[in-house]
Amino acid sequence: QKYSQLLEKKTTKELVHTTLECVKKNMPVEETAWSCCPKNWKSFSSNCYFISTESASWQDSEKDCARMEAHLLVINTQEEQDFIFQNLQEESAYFVGLSDPEGQRHWQWVDQTPYNESSTFWHPREPSDPNERCVVLNFRKSPKRWGWNDVNCLGPQRSVCEMMKIHL
């Protein structure tokens, strides 16, 4: 398929991201595929990540991600989480896509990924309060480490959005 045809097809869609940064992947059968993330997003594995500098409630953060055709970060592996941590500022906290809507400690990822208690990264003594129903990534000085903390969803925090890479 010609690139011009691809472009023609793409422009019928609402353009949310006007600039993409792409990496060429050599494919079999003389085809070349491009793997892209929007400009100013971070690339890791098969996903793109946007780290906000603005603070908002969890709900507004999720909506802001949706406006960019993404969702709040869903952490699937230790490697993914470590990559994210490397790109965060230690003095800030960042909403991720994990919440407990009813305050019953039934944690849910925004994309319906099952919550697996054995692969969680809570700080010691967290989660601590059933009225704190949303999760942030934050850095604690003692011991020095990143981890998860439950907070009130209406309190403004930074956030991390995630989307699958765009393939051209």
Epitope: Q59, E62, S99, P101, N131, R133, N152, C153, L154, G155
Partner: antibody
């Protein structure tokens, strides 16, 4: 069960001030935003704005900036709507409505408070 | 802000009939749409959210559909208690209600 109970009907003259209350029960008050909705007699619903019950920050729709103020008494799980310098077009029924946890649609509503003008 | 155009403004139907109310948004609202029912002198009640999810306790004769800018609420086999006013509302970039549809008994 979850309830939003509003204060009773008000009879007011133009130029006066009114304060309507909305008392929440059956849930954790500071986990859900509180919205205010106006309904003029025989007319549709109009969103006025909302108050973040955790931070106290208010957001007002364009038509409700100026004479309208939202406030909270968190210890009493109560939200307030105050309208100052009342005008004839303010005579309407006012509803408080809880914003859903994730998406903010209005999952529970107060019974409404009717504001009537006296000459 | 995105505006909502609801139609029809009024509708007469008989018990047992099926009716459809539509809402058009002035921009893509990505399924961030709710439907409410309001009876005379009462507060509105949530029927549907996220365009197609029925709220708790809402009978299955109600159904929501649509995407992008076009949404509809369908009521199958109208019951006497279904008569009243219906409002759509988007919650994408703000909160805006449609003008309402008054459903009356024919």
């Amino acid at each position: 069960q979850i309830q939003l109970v509003q204060s009773g009907p008000e009879l007011k003259k133009p130029g006066e001030t009114v304060k309507i209350s909305c008392k929440a029960s059956g849930y954790s008050f500071t986990n859900y935003g509180m919205n205010w909705v106006k309904q003029a007699p025989g007319k549709g619903l109009k969103w006025m704005g909302w108050i973040n019950t955790y931070t106290g920050e208010s957001t007002y729709a364009d038509d409700f900036k100026g004479r309208f103020a939202f406030s909270l008494e968190t210890s009493a799980s109560t939200a307030y709507l105050q309208i100052s310098n009342l005008k004839n077009e303010d005579m309407a029924t006012y509803f408080c409505a809880r914003g859903d946890f994730r998406y903010y649609y209005f999952d529970y509503w107060g019974q409404g408070t009717t504001l009537t003008g006296s000459s | 802000d995105i505006q909502m155009t609801q139609s029809p403004a009024s509708l007469s139907a008989s018990v047992g009939e099926t009716v459809t109310i539509t809402c058009r948004a002035s921009g893509n609202i990505h399924n961030y749409l709710a439907w409410y029912q309001q009876k005379q002198g009462k507060s509105p009640q949530l029927l549907v959210y996220n365009a197609k999810t029925l709220a708790d306790g809402v009978p299955s004769r109600f159904s929501g559909s649509g995407s992008g800018t076009q949404y509809s609420l369908k009521i199958n086999t109208l019951q006497p208690e279904d008569f009243g006013s219906y409002y759509c509302q988007h919650f994408w970039d703000s909160w805006t209600f449609g003008g309402g549809t008054k459903l009356e008994i024919k």
